[in-house]
Amino acid sequence: ADRAALEELVRLQGAHVRGLKEQKASAEQIEEEVTKLLKLKAQLGQDEGKQKFVLKTPKGTRDYSPRQMAVREKVFDVIIRCFKRHGAEVIDTPVFELKETLTGKYGEDSKLIYDLKDQGGELLSLRYDLTVPFARYLAMNKLTNIKRYHIAKVYRRDNPAMTRGRYREFYQCDFDIAGQFDPMIPDAECLKIMCEILSSLQIGNFLVKVNDRRILDGMFAVCGVPDSKFRTICSSVDKLDKVSWEEVKNEMVGEKGLAPEVADRIGDYVQQHGGVSLVEQLLQDPKLSQNKQAVEGLGDLKLLFEYLILFGIDDKISFDLSLARGLDYYTGVIYEAVLLQMPTQAGEEPLGVGSIAAGGRYDGLVGMFDPKGRKVPCVGLSIGVERIFSIVEQRLEASEEKVRTTETQVLVASAQKKLLEERLKLVSELWDAGIKAELLYKKNPKLLNQLQYWEEAGIPLVAIIGEQELRDGVIKLRSVASREEVDVRREDLVEEIRRRTNQPLSTC
């Protein structure tokens, strides 16, 4: 009876949420009712658990199939090659940190941190991003200078829309430059890296929005926002890419207690975006030009645009006053890349995956960990690979393009029975020569079955051993692409496979 009642409540709540959406109810009300729905569904799941255990991955997580992993490896390869091209070293840090390390670094997002149950000693939390652990690493090792990349999983107790490439466990790919350098040179390189990676991945047209925390703070000050409300108003402004100015204003006034005229003044600024000309225009603004912080930020952005022109990426960058990235640790330039149009097939829904890369300058974060408060200036970026995987996967599905899930270059097959020993000897020779090779695990496989596997797996070559060929000291080498078959002398086989697969000399 309880289960039936709960199912009825889930049905009712679902209908209620749909009704609210149709009535265009406020985002807050819808969010509250969706939260209730999710809780009810979770309860239903727990209830189900009492009856029968349902095999599934935890909410907000997923398994990766070999096909998905092949896509992921390709994406990572593009990213890592770019990071290395820019001279980065690689580091790794623990998946969990001391709770204290993460506390107070993420502002309103702190509620999304996963805390681990106390194991009788240290209070631990799963890492929320790779930036705070990096800052802890710098402070702990007293490093003042490093250019590093770090690719690893992070964890957030979000209510994710997994269809849009959002998860509770997901990879981040971070690149950061730590050290005292001349203004805006490292920042410009980070933007260059972002553009290089997004262009190489060919996932569609993108734009990088740029702003500066100091401009935001200066703008709030001249508009009359009390200091205590800067951060919370920041998080409202940051919603402008998703909702209208009216809704943001209502939140500021109705929920966050801002005077309507103050909100209107903010509105005049945050609805502007452009290039270097907007920077120059704001430097002349009668109010902003009187604010030291804003002027510093605008001066740096002017310099940044000069470097971006030299890097040839200024056409990809937009100065956007509504960009107010939610994390508390940013102190200077902030940026976020968004897809402008999704790579869709005719009649297919556009993919709304939002931000695909982001970053900024965080000069104070390391100082939070240093016993003497010594600051290490840092700037970095994070590539939203999960969202990129979603786009690439959907594009591949739409195109029905075959994705190879192995790197096998040659299948060792036999034409007759009783040739297992010969296949084992040959495959071993190939492995020892650094060739990627496979064989079927049967004593006497049918040739047809072997060839079928070879084609389905997309393996470029098959080496066929036959009794006659053994007597003649040759191996038949067949190509999947051209269907041609040639006899190759046994001693030349490795060289011939290398030539045909363009593989340089290599050994295990």
């Epitope: 009825e8 209730k36 509620k111």
Partner: antibody, heavy 120, light 107 residues
């Protein structure tokens, strides 16, 4: 055992303030939306306010909006109702209740109630 | 606000009788309805939620039905402990409102 116990009621003059408490035990308090419901002497029941498990959402009946504040302390398993600018018509027994299935606005567990009398 | 109207406001019945109490909502509330029982000096006790779902521990002689704007609570065979006041409550939208109550008395 699973229970709710209210306290803090009493006699107060119009315009005065009072803070009601509700101590929860026997269940995971932070999982549940909680609510205050009142009943004037000899009258029916009236929903006053609710708060979500995460503190994120609160709501108030128009009659009490701006005067009453609902809050909770999950570490202490406690729910509170701060009542300011009290009026004669606020005289009632105040019950705290827990939402059924954590989130549905129906009280499946109620306290015994605490009487608030507003009178000069 | 959604108005909830109960009828009758009081009813006299004997042990073993079948009793039906009606509740009407001023607008559609789907099945977002609960029924409570309250005895003098005590807190209300949840009997039915989601219009027809019996709360655990409540005897099966209590049943609820209805959807939209018209709902009923039925007690199939009255027991001595059932004499009390019964309230309906809508849980569709805030402010969640109660009916004015139906007093069930011994005949």
């Amino acid at each position: 055992q699973v229970q709710l116990v209210e306290s803090g009621g009493g006699l107060v003059k119009p315009g005065g303030s009072l803070r009601l408490s509700c101590a929860a035990s026997g269940f995971t308090f932070s999982d549940y939306y909680m609510t205050w419901i009142r009943q004037a002497p000899g009258k029916g029941l009236e929903w006053v306010s609710y708060i979500s498990g995460s503190f994120r959402y609160t709501n108030y009946a128009d009659k009490v909006k701006g005067r009453f504040t609902i809050s909770r302390d999950n570490a202490k398993n406690s729910l509170y109702l701060q009542m300011n600018s009290l009026r004669d018509e606020d005289t009632a027994v105040y019950f705290c209740a827990r939402y059924v299935y954590q989130v549905v606005a129906i009280g499946d567990l109620w306290g015994q109630g605490t009487l608030v009398t507003v009178s000069s | 606000d959604i108005q909830m109207t109960q009828s009758p406001s009081s009813v006299s019945a004997s042990v073993g009788d079948r009793v039906t109490i009606t509740c009407r909502a001023s607008q559609g509330i789907s099945s977002w309805l609960a029924w409570y029982q309250q005895k003098p000096g005590r807190a209300p006790k949840l009997l039915i939620f989601a219009a027809s779902s019996l709360q655990s521990g409540v005897p099966s002689r209590f049943s609820g039905s209805g959807s939209g704007t018209h709902f009923t609570l039925t007690i199939s065979s009255l027991q001595p402990e059932d004499f009390a006041t019964y309230y309906c409550q809508q849980a569709e939208s805030f402010p969640y409102t109660f009916g004015q109550g139906t007093k069930l008395e011994i005949k």
